[in-house]
């Protein structure tokens, strides 16, 4: 079947990095500069992505694969394949329409991106606050108040801070 197909369609023999050139009797021609084909049998090569402006080149374009971009320092990637760059903020801040703003009291952000999230409510787990929260850090919950009463035989180690969430994008 493969042999039959290749007889019927000479383009199927053109490997990645080439295209089937109709102008040259369907000869396999190399992709021109700044273009690529990532699969065989293509009739055209795709234009390489250019990492301009806020984008930096993470991986150069080759004849068989597109360029890959990331963001200039102070920005981070958004979207599939880093389609956009979004500015970083400091820890303890979140990005708003008015730029980077400090987290409100009772919320924190321990990353340079994403949103401020509420401190853990230790009392929901029957625990007490061992270390107060800040704009940059969640509270650390400790043993329940009952565990700290005189005569208590052991102290429960503090629960690990909860896993940071991810902001919706």
């Amino acid at each position: 079947f493969e042999r039959t197909r290749s007889l019927q369609d000479p383009c199927s023999n053109c490997p990645a990095g080439t295209f089937c050139d109709n102008n040259r009797n369907q000869i396999c021609s190399p992709c021109p500069p700044n273009s690529f084909s990532s699969a065989g049998g293509q009739r055209t090569c795709d234009i390489c992505r250019q990492c301009k402006g806020v984008f930096r080149t993470r991986k150069e374009c080759s004849s068989t694969s597109n360029a890959e971009c990331d963001c200039t320092p102070g920005f981070h990637c958004l979207g599939a394949g880093c389609s956009m760059c979004e500015q970083d903020c400091k820890q303890g801040q979140e990005l708003t329409k008015k730029g980077c703003k400090d987290c409100c009291f009772g919320t924190f952000n321990d990353q340079k991106r994403g949103i401020c999230r509420p401190w853990t409510n230790c009392s929901l787990d029957g625990k007490s606050v061992l270390v107060n929260g800040t704009k940059e850090r969640d509270v650390v919950c400790g043993p329940s108040p009952a565990d700290l009463s005189p005569g208590a035989s052991s102290v429960t180690p503090p629960a690990p801070a909860r896993e940071p969430g991810h902001s919706p994008q």
Epitope: L78, S83, E86
Partner: nanobody, 123 residues
Amino acid sequence: EVQLVESGGGLVQPGGSLRLSCVASGFTFSNYWMMWFRQAPGKGLEWVANINQDGSEKYFVDSVEGRFTISRDNAKNSLYLQMNSLRAEDTAVYYCARGGDGYSSSHYGTDVWGQGTTVTVSS
């Protein structure tokens, strides 16, 4: 080709004014938030201002609030930054950038940038 081209930079004395322009082509300008960023010599990129699709929402970094105004003319595919009461610390290369459309992408992400226009504030 999607493109942004800035103009209007130059040398100005402290207290003076400049108006930067940015002309967009290759996309539907009125669908996007637009932004100005700047990069002072030896510093990182800093967000300056942004404006929503119809110009009804405008936001500024604190250091330029009350001195700079951002506006747009969707009929002319143009974005503007009016800079008044300029200070030495406003010296920078100014870039206009396309933001998100607010629907399929983040308001705050950017993808298309101009080549920049240089503003020098000096006596």
